[in-house]
């Protein structure tokens, strides 16, 4: 379901990643150097930036982030 409109709810931050608000609605997500072998599963649709560097992700399927704009 869609998140209710609110100024007090935190946008989704994947486990172990570091998140930082980007303006009024968006979220910058840093998942670098976490030893990930696949994409985080619970990325927010409000993600404006995603850092997956220094992980072990060897391949991406076509359209790997369908929820992102």
């Amino acid at each position: 379901g869609s998140s209710p409109r609110s100024g007090v709810l935190l946008r989704g931050c994947p486990t172990h990643c570091h998140c930082e608000p980007d303006g009024r609605m968006l979220l910058r997500v840093d998942c670098s150097d976490l030893g990930l072998s696949e994409l985080p599963s619970n990325l927010s649709v409000f993600t404006s930036y995603l850092d997956l560097s220094m992980n072990n992700i060897s391949q991406l399927l076509p359209n790997p982030l369908p929820s992102l704009r």
Epitope: R5, G7, V8, L9, L10, C13, H18, C19, P21
Partner: antibody, heavy 117, light 107 residues
Amino acid sequence: QVQLVQSGSELKKPGASVKVSCKASGYTFTNYWMQWVRQAPGQGLEWIGEIDPSDSYTNYNQGFTGRFVLSVDTSVSTAYLQISSLKAEDTAVYYCARSLSGYVDYWGQGTTVTVSS
Amino acid sequence: DIQMTQSPSSLSASVGDRVTITCRASQDISNRLNWYQQKPGKAVKLLISYRSRLHSGVPSRFSGSGSGTDYTLTISSLQPEDFATYYCQQGNSLPPTFGGGTKLEIK
């Protein structure tokens, strides 16, 4: 710098109403939500509700619907909390606080409301 | 509503001590956790958002961690100005709810 200046302490009788104000400065008032939180004597923090000053959209905690009304006057960058039909258990410190992407980064100094006959 | 259980409710410690405060949610809150500091007669201050993001101006001796339902605030070396009451708050669902607070006192 960001400042949220709240109105002074209030002493009210049961059944009366009170309107607490929160004057914002140092930022664009309509770019941030305003949260309201209360703290009863010796107790923790309890969320009352929030208002988006850009269009006055509100969310309330279920326990604070009806007697508690949030509003804003963007012309003077001020948010208001009005409480009607005051009860003794409404005695508390009431805080306004601004929020953006989910966290409350600046708080007012608090307004003490005492309800006593 | 999501219940936030904070422990301990009070804690005595000395300057230089390492202190850990725990916050447990009644359900998974997906890292959506903030920590605040309150001192008597002063405005409440944001310390940490998104479980581990240090707010600007907050000393690096403060850190946050955890996942799922369990989160911690750690102060690596207590300073005199750190004696205060600390609250966790979940931002996962409405209404946002706070822990009961941890009062940190000088031993």
